[in-house]
Structures are given as structure tokens and as C-alpha cells.
């Protein structure tokens, strides 16, 4: 001789976010007469998910027709599952009572776990640009995933980084989780074309990790090197002086020529040439009329790059001496030119 049992055959059910969860429940008898209700959680704070007797539960459908005589299948389907639906669901048999139905027996519960994909990782770098040899921090964030287990890796140009710290929040049980990681990257002069990649692997991604990228071109500033040289005579009374601005990034650059400390001309880099490593070169010419000068002339090429303090390089032009090529000797790469006469 037995009384009714409520059987929930599945101890746990795992469902992907957006899908439908089936929670199975059968009773072993038609008696005692009374409705079945489904709850999430136990105790006084439990949440009603479905009531056979009354109420509107738009996301819930019954697996079988509960109006059929002798129906003892009280399984339900919950549609469009989100991580917020995770929890333990109890199928509870009530018996008819006056004035209210009385809870008679509960199933053992089915734990619904929701597999939710992490959001696309968002990588952000420092607010201000930094120069080579400096260490900068990149952060990577991804949200809304479940279960909690997740793997995050950092790469720079395909090479895995090791200097990073990662946190998954919250620490305790939650419907979904977030990951936050900070990686330290040492910049080099060759990093204009470099990429920092944050890679997130999760059970929901079926071996196809999500990646977030940051281009170091947004982070790096490569200061230029300057070389001022005097070119061969073009005419008896003219000397051509060039300022070669090499290996700079980004392109934003303003050049000022000074003759004996006085501004002669200011120009903005326009027709630059790009090097293989992504940096730029630019060349500015200054045509000096020697006959206009009685004394030696100090020519200064002053460059303000990307809003930074100006750097300069000078060249002494001897008026008395027969003009000849002189100046610093750093090798030039591809150069652009700019010609201007000064009278």
C-alpha cells in the first residue's frame, strides 16, 4: 500500500540560453486530488513558475494535456531560457483543501543550469599614447556567461603573454558571470602594426574562442629622429638644406625652420612616406640665399610631434666658406621633399 509520490527523474538539466528547458515530473497516482505547482527554489521565498489551477504563465507550456483523465504527467517546458532562470525547480503536488489547497508532496527537485555564451571580449588600452620601452596596460572584459569556468589568454602578434591578472566575478553562485583581465605590454619601436589579442574560451563556444583586439597603433608614439644636411650648391648664391624626419608615428607632425633663432617657415607633414614597420618619414627643404647674409647662419629644424615638446636639430651654415655638403650622417630611407625659397 502506497501513497502518491512525485517523481522528478532528472537531477539536473543543462540548457543553452535562448533554448527551451523541459522539466520532467510525474505523479504515481491521481489521488489525493489537487493541482500541481512548479516552484523555483524552496522555502517561503520560493518563486511560483506554474500553477495548474490558475494564473497566466506565458513562457510555460505543459508537455501533456493536463485536462485528460488519468493524466499523471506534469512535466513543463519553459521557453527562451536566460541565465536568470537558473536554479532548482520543484514539482509540488497539492491536495484540495478548505479554504486553500494544501501542499502534499514535493519532488526531489531538478537543478536547471543555463549555459550562456560570453559577450565578445572588449579590449581597451591606455588613455594616452606611450613611447617604446614603456610598459602599458590593456584590459579585457567579457560578460554574461555561465557556467563560471572560463579561460582567458593574451597574445601579442600571436605570441602568448604571461604578465596578466584575471578576475571572474562574482566569486559566489550567480546566474551569470563576468571576466576582467589586465595585461602588461612592453612597447617596441616596431609595434605600430602590432595587435594585442584577448582570447576567451568557454564551454558554450564549442572550441571556437572569442577574440577581442586592440591595435598598438592606437597606443604607441614613436618619436622621430632628425637629420639636417646641406645639399650641393644649386646656384652661385643659394644653399639647399634638408631636414629628414625619420621613423615617427603617428603622422601628426609640425616642422618649423629657424634662421638664427627666428622662425623662417612652419609646415605640417603632408606627403609622408610609410616605412614597412608602419612608421613615417618626411623631408623638408630650405633654400637659403647666402648673399643675403653677412655672417654665418645657424639653421634649426624644429619638430613638434603629436603634441609633444619640440625636438630640434641645428646646422651651421658658414657664409664665408665655399658651400659644400656637411651635416650629420644618419642613413635616410624613403624621403619626401618640400622646396621653399627664402629671399
Amino acid at each position: 500500500e502506497e501513497e502518491l509520490q512525485v517523481i522528478q527523474p532528472d537531477k539536473s538539466v543543462l540548457v543553452a540560453a535562448g533554448e527551451t528547458a523541459t522539466l520532467r515530473c510525474t505523479a504515481t497516482s491521481l489521488i489525493p486530488v489537487g493541482p500541481i505547482q512548479w516552484f523555483r527554489g524552496a522555502g517561503p521565498g520560493r518563486e511560483l513558475i506554474y500553477n495548474q489551477k490558475e494564473g497566466h504563465f506565458p513562457r510555460v507550456t505543459t508537455v501533456s494535456d493536463l485536462t485528460k483523465r488519468n493524466n499523471m504527467d506534469f512535466s513543463i517546458r519553459i521557453g527562451n531560457i536566460t541565465p536568470a532562470d537558473a536554479g532548482t525547480y520543484y514539482c509540488v503536488k497539492f491536495r484540495k483543501g478548505s479554504p486553500d489547497d494544501v501542499e502534499f508532496k514535493s519532488g526531489a527537485g531538478t537543478e536547471l543550469s543555463v549555459r550562456a555564451k560570453p559577450s565578445a571580449p572588449v579590449v581597451s588600452g591606455p588613455a594616452a599614447r606611450a613611447t617604446p620601452q614603456h610598459t602599458v596596460s590593456f584590459t579585457c572584459e567579457s560578460h554574461g556567461f555561465s557556467p563560471r569556468d572560463i579561460t582567458l589568454k593574451w597574445f601579442k602578434n600571436g605570441n602568448e603573454l604571461s604578465d596578466f591578472q584575471t578576475n571572474v566575478d562574482p566569486v559566489g553562485e550567480s546566474v551569470s558571470y563576468s571576466i576582467h583581465s589586465t595585461a602588461k605590454v612592453v612597447l617596441t619601436r616596431e609595434d605600430v602594426h602590432s595587435q594585442v589579442i584577448c582570447e576567451v574560451a568557454h564551454v558554450t563556444l564549442q572550441g571556437d574562442p572569442l577574440r577581442g583586439t586592440a591595435n598598438l597603433s592606437e597606443t604607441i608614439r614613436v618619436p622621430p629622429t632628425l637629420e639636417v644636411t646641406q645639399q650641393p650648391v644649386r646656384a652661385e648664391n643659394q644653399v639647399n638644406v634638408t631636414c629628414q624626419v625619420r621613423k615617427f608615428y603617428p603622422q601628426r607632425l609640425q616642422l618649423t625652420w629657424l634662421e638664427n633663432g627666428n622662425v623662417s617657415r612652419t609646415e605640417t607633414a603632408s606627403t609622408v612616406t610609410e616605412n614597412k614597420d608602419g612608421t613615417y618619414n618626411w623631408m623638408s627643404w630650405l633654400l637659403v640665399n647666402v648673399s643675403a647674409h653677412r655672417d654665418d647662419v645657424k639653421l634649426t629644424c624644429q619638430v613638434e610631434h603629436d603634441g609633444q615638446p619640440a625636438v630640434s636639430k641645428s646646422h651651421d651654415l658658414k657664409v664665408s666658406a665655399h658651400p659644400k655638403e656637411q651635416g650629420s650622417n644618419t642613413a635616410a630611407e624613403n624621403t619626401g621633399s618640400n622646396e621653399r625659397n627664402i629671399y
Epitope: 497516482s29 489521488i31 486530488v33 484540495k96 483543501g97 479554504p99 494544501v102
Partner: antibody, heavy 120, light 108 residues
């Protein structure tokens, strides 16, 4: 048509046990809940409990727990009530009854009753 | 349990008279869960009205029922000799199923 045929009258001594039967016909026995109702002479009706023969599960009025045991035999379409430790208070007519339907709640069909007399 | 109290316990009426008996519940009963039976001496109860006002099969139209909540009644519009019996109300709103103490109708 639905019929519930109950066993004949019983005369038993105090302290003894008795088992009375209710044979169902005219419907699928295992699909319907059967109840047992007690009526003492000149008194009202008291619901004892019910049995669902489909899974041989029972539900009792608290007042009759320990006194009555309901069973069923699907092969013979018969329900039984066993009463133990009998006293004169158990002397009554015992009816089996079936609801019109599972969710009807009214006894559409009744057996003719079995008179139980407990006497030394 | 939901106690059903019937009144009067006994009544004696003349043929053709209108009769009303009441059934009062200690807890509210859904109208679909209140039923009436007729029991003649030495016989089993016979279903009379189910769900407050629905006549069971073969029951004459002179019988009617009404009520809601905790108060229900059974009316016989014009009593006939065959109506002499005890009438019981029964609730199916909550366990245990209970019956009223009965109203015994005697024909004068």
C-alpha cells in the same frame, strides 16, 4: 452500465479484523478512484478514504488512518477495505462509491453497502 | 475539515408543498464542488444534484439547487410521496470529503 457489487453482511467479534469487498464492472477499473464511506445506523455519511487502482495508491481521512486499509486487485476488478481492532464503534454500513469522473467530485455510483456488526 | 451543517434536521410537509433545506459550510466551497444526495431507508445514497444546481440523470425537474460560498440550499418545488428520504449535502472543495448530517424529509 457501471455497477459496484459489495460483499455480504459481516458479524465479527470485538478485537478481530474484517475484509469487505467491492467488485466493479461496466468500466475500466484501473482508471477511476474508488472511495469508501461509513454510515452508522441512523447517522450521517463519513468518508473513510480512497484508492486509485491504476497504481494501487491510497489517501485516507486522518480519522481512519490505522483503522482502515484500502487495497485493490486489478485482475479481478475488486477493491477491498480491511478494518482492524474492531469495536462496537465500527458497526456500520460500509459503502463503496465512485466519482462521476476524476474531476467530478460527486459520487455518481454507489455499491449497495455491507453491514458490519461488531458484537461479542 | 470543512464541516457541513444541514438544517432542519427533520421536516414534515404535505404533498404538493414547496420545501427548502439548507447546507452551511464552515469554509467556503466552490459552487462546482457542492453536491446533494437522496437516501431512502435501507438503500444507498442516490446522486441528486451536482455542482450546486445540476440535476443528476433521471432526477425530476421539481428538484433544484442554489447557493455559493458557505451557504447552499436544495428546493423541491412540489413535494411528492416518493420524495420521503434523507437528503445529504457533500463538499469536494477540500480533504477530507465531508457530508452534512442530513435533513430527513417526512411526508404528512
Amino acid at each position: 452500465q457501471v455497477q459496484l457489487q459489495q460483499s455480504g453482511p459481516e458479524l465479527v467479534k470485538p478485537g478481530a479484523s474484517v475484509k469487505m469487498s467491492c467488485k466493479a464492472s461496466g468500466y475500466t477499473f484501473s482508471e477511476y478512484v474508488l472511495s469508501w464511506v461509513k454510515q452508522r445506523t441512523g447517522q450521517g455519511l463519513e468518508w473513510i478514504g480512497e484508492i486509485y487502482p491504476g497504481t494501487i495508491t491510497t489517501y485516507y481521512n486522518e480519522k481512519f488512518k490505522g483503522k482502515a486499509t484500502l487495497t485493490a486487485d486489478k485482475s479481478s476488478n475488486t477493491a477491498y477495505i480491511q478494518l482492524t481492532s474492531l469495536t462496537s464503534e465500527d458497526s456500520a454500513v460500509y459503502f463503496c462509491g465512485r466519482f462521476y469522473d476524476y474531476d467530478g467530485g460527486w459520487f455518481a455510483y454507489w455499491g449497495q453497502g455491507t453491514l458490519l456488526t461488531v458484537s461479542a | 475539515e470543512n464541516v457541513l451543517t444541514q438544517s432542519p434536521e427533520k421536516m414534515a410537509v404535505s404533498l404538493g408543498q414547496k420545501v427548502t433545506m439548507t447546507c452551511s459550510a464552515s469554509s467556503s466551497v466552490s459552487s462546482s464542488d457542492l453536491h446533494w444526495y437522496q437516501q431512502k431507508s435501507g438503500a444507498s445514497p442516490k446522486p441528486l444534484i451536482h455542482g450546486t444546481s445540476n440535476l443528476a440523470s433521471g432526477v425530476p425537474a421539481r428538484f433544484s439547487g442554489s447557493g455559493s460560498g458557505t451557504s447552499y440550499s436544495l428546493t423541491i418545488s412540489s413535494v411528492e410521496a416518493e420524495d420521503a428520504a434523507t437528503y445529504y449535502c457533500q463538499q469536494w472543495s477540500g480533504y477530507p470529503w465531508t457530508f452534512g448530517g442530513g435533513t430527513n424529509l417526512e411526508i404528512k
